[in-house]
Interface confidence: medium
């Protein structure tokens, strides 16, 4: 288990260029919303400090038919060394709390920014 400032990420640490691309994709999603993202779909909130890319992917795997986050899902799967099935990381859900996809994406974005600021990926 590779731990980056509390952001547990099973497998090799993604190169900073790939993470930059992920951040920019999350930026695009958060900034270009003309309507509720994924029709307001709800996903499990996760503990981003304890969880990692696989956990984030696990939560987003429950969302289907939302083209806006398909690229994010693909990028996250590239950071996760094994196939993720929905509900695999239920123990890392935050008190069984569900939030909108838009909030989930923004939370993930801010967490990655924080890790970059702290020099975890530089």
């Amino acid at each position: 288990l590779t731990c980056l400032g509390g952001f547990a990420s099973p497998g090799p640490v993604p190169p900073s260029t790939a993470l930059r691309e992920l951040i920019e994709e999350l930026v695009n999603i958060t900034q270009n919303q003309k309507a509720p993202l994924c029709n307001g779909s709800m996903v499990w909130s996760i503990n981003l400090t304890a969880g990692g890319f696989c956990v984030a992917l696990d939560s987003l795997t429950n969302v289907s038919g939302c083209s806006a986050i398909e690229k994010t899902q693909r990028m996250l799967s590239g950071f996760c060394p094994h196939k993720v099935s929905a509900g695999q990381f239920s123990s890392l859900h935050v008190r069984d709390t569900k939030i909108e996809v838009a909030q989930f994406v923004k939370d993930l974005l801010l967490h990655l920014k924080k890790l970059f600021r702290e020099g975890q990926f530089n």
Epitope: T30, Q31, N32, K106, L109, L110, K113, R117
Partner: antibody, heavy 122, light 108 residues
Amino acid sequence: EVQLLESGGGLVQPGGSLRLSCAASGFTFSSYAMSWVRQAPGKGLEWVSAISGSGGSTYYADSVKGRFTISRDNSKNTLYLQMNSLRAEDTAVYYCAKADFWSGTLWGFDYWGQGTLVTVSS
Amino acid sequence: SYVLTQPPSVSVAPGQTARITCGGNNIGNKIVHWYQQKPGQAPVLVVYDDSDRPSGIPERFSGSNSGNTATLTISRVEAGDEADYYCQVWDSSSDHVVFGGGTKLTVL
């Protein structure tokens, strides 16, 4: 310790030109976007311009576009603002500010210089 | 272009809680930063990324952001907190940095 020191302000006639400089130290200058923010006497903060760490991307407020040019010399750790066709409404204290991240959408400004006063008057 | 609306002034007694709002269309989708500026001084970042505090900023300063309103909360207000406060976001539609008009906090 991060330090930003502006210079180049002064009194100039309408239609005149001025070049502001901001000498930076205490951080890896080329890794961060930089910005100019101004404040007219007794007024609020107004963003003027920003430039990416590499200098490849520049951004301008509508009020200065076509008149002001932002640039940087990473070998000298210095930020510049070339101001042409100055107007009375450009009178303000001009602050140099360091962005806290490389992606524009996420920019906050974590360090500011003390400012340099530009007065445009005949 | 994107507009951020702040109340011109907020007054609070020492020891009480001050709440300064920053309104904007779907601002909850954006990332908000807050600055404190005392007379004759440069602005200081007090809250970034909606709710994070830079080192050196007291825990009394906190931020939240959802819907159409971002809020800077200052608990147990002290006389030294008297200043102008500005919110700021990036507007991706124009590629501009946007500041709110500022709020003058008066400690009674």
